[in-house]
């Protein structure tokens, strides 16, 4: 994933007495928050694995890369990064693995340069629809976000709200059409059973989409037609049984696409014929010779590329009079 990485060589650790710095005062130019490491040369602040329960108030204005990973933040309130003067340079923010279960509306407001955001490995039971757009207007100001990393943000079963997790995430992605400039979206390992049909059409700038390690059974109602810039589509480790003609045609029509389909339980029956024909001709599927049948048992482990129409039969449906209860 594209979480911010640091080229910092010289970090200065804050002295403990800075912990009580008054947030109302503008931070000193070289000040570093308690429990953090700072490198002005690399424009990087790291507050990593420190069990912080809130975002430090006294972040230096120069910060471009901010790591707040491995903490205990729990809630990200509105304006969590709003400062005076604003953190105008902050471009990459990594909040992964910080026990966040709630991200409120406007949590990332007043970050005009924020291009990369990583919220992975947080059990987000409550992600506001306006977490990324900042307002509930039907059309919001465009977000500067280019990369949004949301891998493994699904909370445990017993902590989920009485609503679709997929729906909650998609609502946040689509609110106010703020993410029209998003180029990379990672949604791996979220137990998604389906992809709401309107989500991709409203993210026209996507170059990279990672939906790997979910539970997607079908792409029948998902349209890739508008994603003319899409370069990589990761669908490995899902529950896909077959790709149908409509999906195959749409993928083939994308000029730069590479599709990853490994580790899916392909069902090699009569419904697979179109996909097999397509696989033999297409160049868009990476490692296509590694796609093998999972079902029926007699076909298990066979390479899809080696199948022909005679191999792909469906058991005849018995007339009602012959069916057993």
């Amino acid at each position: 994933s594209s979480s911010p990485t640091s080229s910092a060589s010289s970090f200065s650790s804050s002295a403990p007495f800075l912990a009580s710095a008054v947030s109302a005062q503008p931070p000193l130019p070289d000040q570093c928050p308690a429990l953090c490491e700072c490198s002005e040369a690399a424009r990087t602040v790291k507050c990593v694995n420190r069990n912080l329960t809130e975002v430090p108030t006294d972040l230096p204005a120069y910060v471009r890369n901010l790591f707040l990973t491995g903490n205990q933040l729990a809630v990200l309130p509105a304006g969590a990064f709003a400062r005076r003067p604003p953190l105008a340079e902050l471009a990459a923010l990594n909040l992964s693995g910080s026990r966040l279960d709630e991200v409120r509306a406007g949590a990332f407001e007043h970050l005009p340069s924020l291009r990369q955001l990583d919220l992975s490995h947080n059990p987000l039971a409550d992600l506001s629809p306006f977490a990324f757009s900042g307002s509930n207007a039907s059309v919001s100001a465009p977000s500067p976000l280019v990369e949004l990393i949301l891998n493994h943000i699904v909370p445990p079963e017993d902590e989920r709200q009485n609503r679709s997790f997929e729906g909650m995430v998609v609502a946040a992605l689509l609110a106010g059409r703020a993410l029209q400039g998003l180029r990379r979206l990672e949604l791996a390992s979220n137990h998604f059973l389906y992809l709401p049909r309107d989500v991709l059409a409203q993210l026209p700038s996507l170059r990279h989409l990672d939906l790997s390690n979910n539970s997607l059974v079908s792409l029948t109602y998902v349209s890739f037609r508008n994603l003319t810039h899409l370069e990589s589509l990761h669908l490995e480790d899902n529950a896909l049984k077959v790709l149908h003609n409509g999906t195959l045609a749409e993928l083939q029509g994308l000029p730069h696409i590479r599709v990853f389909l490994d580790n899916n339980p392909w069902v090699c029956d009569c419904h697979m014929a179109d996909m097999v024909t397509w696989l033999k001709e297409t160049e868009v599927v990476q490692g296509k010779d590694r796609l093998t049948c999972a079902y029926p048992e007699k076909m298990r482990n066979r390479v899809l590329l080696e199948l022909n129409s005679a191999d792909l039969d469906c058991d005849p449906i018995l007339p009602p009079s012959l069916q057993t209860s």
Epitope: N213, N263, T292, R300, V303
Partner: antibody
């Protein structure tokens, strides 16, 4: 029925190379990947790599990349593994097996002994 | 690489016993786990694939369960021909890796 036939044992000298075979029968050879596994005496199983007979694609475990070379001859439904620059560490039983993720049929193994 | 750990390198049981062999992965592997039996003569057979699915021809006294990182193979009614070494293997990532094996012996 599916069978993978491997041949007995070979004694080879240190520094030499050896090429072992795995003849498949009872199924369409090009339709299934072939995997190779190493087992040192009294030890567990170690995945070496796999090959797709229908197109020749291979994957190797990093630690065997400069040691093993996997090939196939589709006309005889036979997979081969060549081991180069042999040392005593290469003394082991080498199995071929059918499959890419689970290995549903195994050969009986070829024992390689490296000794001067 | 994903490490597969079989904590018991050997187990002793009586005929007719219910025996459980465990296997742990160093990271989450979904249900991408297989079990093999290696007889003393070196013969290797697939028993269980995808954590819990019985390979054709394998007796129904063998069963598999687990998910994520912790898995087990159970033999419900131990028979003399079950004396063997049992290996787990993950296929979540390359390289494929095996557990160290659990040798099953008769008391």
């Amino acid at each position: 029925q599916v069978q993978l036939q491997q041949f007995g044992a070979e004694l080879v000298k240190p520094g030499a190379a050896v090429k072992m075979s795995c003849k498949a029968s009872g199924y369409t050879f090009t339709s299934y990947w072939i995997t190779w596994v190493k087992q040192r005496p009294g030890q567990g199983l170690d995945w070496i790599g796999d090959i797709y007979p229908g197109g020749g694609s291979t994957n190797y475990h990093e630690k065997f990349k400069s040691k093993a070379t996997l090939t196939v001859d589709t006309s005889s439904s036979t997979a081969y593994m060549q081991l180069s620059s042999l040392t005593s560490e290469d003394s082991a039983v080498y199995y071929c097996a059918r499959g890419l993720r689970d290995f549903d049929y195994w050969g009986q193994g070829t024992t390689i002994t490296v000794s001067s | 690489d994903i490490q597969m750990t079989q904590t018991a390198s050997s187990l002793s049981a009586s005929l007719g016993d219910r025996v459980t062999i465990s296997c742990r992965a160093s990271q989450h592997i979904n249900n991408y786990l297989n079990w093999y039996q290696q007889k003393p003569d070196g013969t290797v057979k697939l028993l269980i694939y995808s954590t819990s699915r019985l390979h054709s021809g394998v007796p129904s006294r063998f069963s598999g369960s687990g998910s994520g990182t912790d898995f087990s193979l159970t033999i419900s009614n131990l028979e003399p021909e079950d004396i063997a070494t049992y290996y787990c293997q993950q296929y979540s990532k390359l390289p494929r890796t095996f557990g160290g094996g659990t040798k099953l012996e008769i008391k």
